[in-house]
């Protein structure tokens, strides 16, 4: 069966300078590989954060995800500002070894306004 | 630099229990899961348990259940490793190790060695 | 289980792959481990199928495809003689294995 990957919120509203939670759940671990969240879509989009070890600032995983068993792939942005706004997307990927990693399972994505305090 | 130092190997009887442990330094501890492995007399690598960062999941080869525990103290940046019923075929180095995010190794400590004899 | 053949054997300079099969590409994560002598620490050349410890030399890079991972050592050296173990963790059972490891000899 094909992993699904949940974004609950379509949107959220955020105060400048706060802290907002995007909420990723996969339910499946298989094929084995990355997960990522990335803000806009297509050739322009950014990578927010990746679940393999290497330090984002101002974002941190919200659950354990060194669980084996994890399947919640939530971030935590802190000291949200205006340039945050955008559509985020939770990835599935598999892995590639040799060559980039495949995509094969987006979110619906969570559109974050930042409101001005 | 990461550091990982075992400590608490020793001879014991069979039958008898001891407790490894496994001071960490160099790293936020607290974040990484780790691993124990084991290697006996002229033999290859073999693991044995694992622990998620947070300490609450805890993952074992059949051959132990039942008879080792692995635990944290995040506090302390420590691991441990409970052994008990102890018999001639435990005798082996005993390594922790720091995972990587996919649960492989990337860091090891020197070992301690436990030998278990009458 | 993972299986490498026991022994693999080189001159200097040239390049040596060791094969590691059994794995499910699926489901496996494959590393590769060095020992230079029995009970002293290994130590990762690979992990994550290809990704390189920034301490170990560029000579050493890995790739995995299908049900096998290699490990290749491009230009060995004699400090390279050890034994390499091949890793893997299999997230359907969450369980991590190792290969019985194969002895590099350089000539």
């Known amino acids: 069966t094909e992993v699904k990957v949940t974004q609950p919120e379509k949107s959220v509203s955020v105060a400048a300078g706060d802290s907002t939670i995007l909420n990723c759940t996969v339910t499946s671990l298989l094929p084995v590989g990355p997960i990522r969240w990335y803000r806009g879509v297509g050739q322009s989009r950014l990578l927010i954060y990746s679940f393999t070890g290497e330090h984002f600032p101002r974002i941190r995983n919200v659950s354990d995800t060194t669980k084996r068993n994890n399947m919640d792939f939530s971030i935590r942005i802190s000291n949200v500002t205006p340039e945050d706004a955008g559509t985020y997307y939770c990835v599935k990927f598999q892995r590639g070894s040799s060559e980039p990693d495949t995509e094969i399972q987006s979110g619906g994505g969570t559109e974050v306004y930042v409101l001005a305090k | 630099d990461v550091q990982l130092v075992e400590s608490g190997g020793g001879v014991v009887r069979p039958g008898e229990s001891l407790r490894l442990s496994c001071a960490a330094s160099?790293?936020?501890?607290?974040?990484?899961?780790m691993s124990w492995v084991r290697q006996a007399p002229g033999k290859g690598l073999e693991w044995l348990a694992g622990?998620?960062?947070?300490?609450?999941?805890?993952y074992y080869i059949d051959s132990v259940k039942g008879r080792f525990t692995i635990s944290r103290d995040n506090p302390k940046n420590s691991l441990y490793l409970q052994m008990s019923s102890l018999t001639a075929e435990d005798t082996a180095v005993y390594y922790c190790?720091?995972?990587?995010?996919?649960?492989?190794?990337?860091?090891w400590g020197l070992g301690t060695l436990v030998t278990v004899s009458s | 289980a993972l299986t490498q053949p026991a022994s693999v054997s080189a001159n200097p300079g040239e390049t040596v792959k060791i094969t590691c099969s059994g794995g499910?590409?699926?489901?496996?994560?494959y590393a590769w481990y060095q020992q230079k002598s029995p009970g002293s620490a290994p130590v990762t050349v690979i992990?994550?199928?290809?990704k390189r410890p920034s301490d170990i030399p560029s000579r050493f890079s890995g790739s995995a495809s299908g049900s096998a991972a290699t490990l290749i050592i491009t230009g060995v050296r004699v400090e390279d003689e050890a034994v390499y173990y091949c890793?893997?963790?299999?997230?359907?059972?969450?369980?991590?294995?190792f290969g019985a490891g194969t002895t590099l000899t350089v000539l």
């Open positions: 190790a720091r995972e990587t995010w996919n649960h492989l190794f990337d860091y």
């Open positions: 160099g790293f936020t501890f607290s974040s990484y899961a």
């Open positions: 622990i998620s960062a947070g300490g609450s999941d805890t």
């Open positions: 499910d590409y699926y489901s496996t994560y």
């Open positions: 992990h994550s199928d290809d």
């Open positions: 890793g893997g963790y299999d997230g359907r059972t969450y369980i991590n294995t």
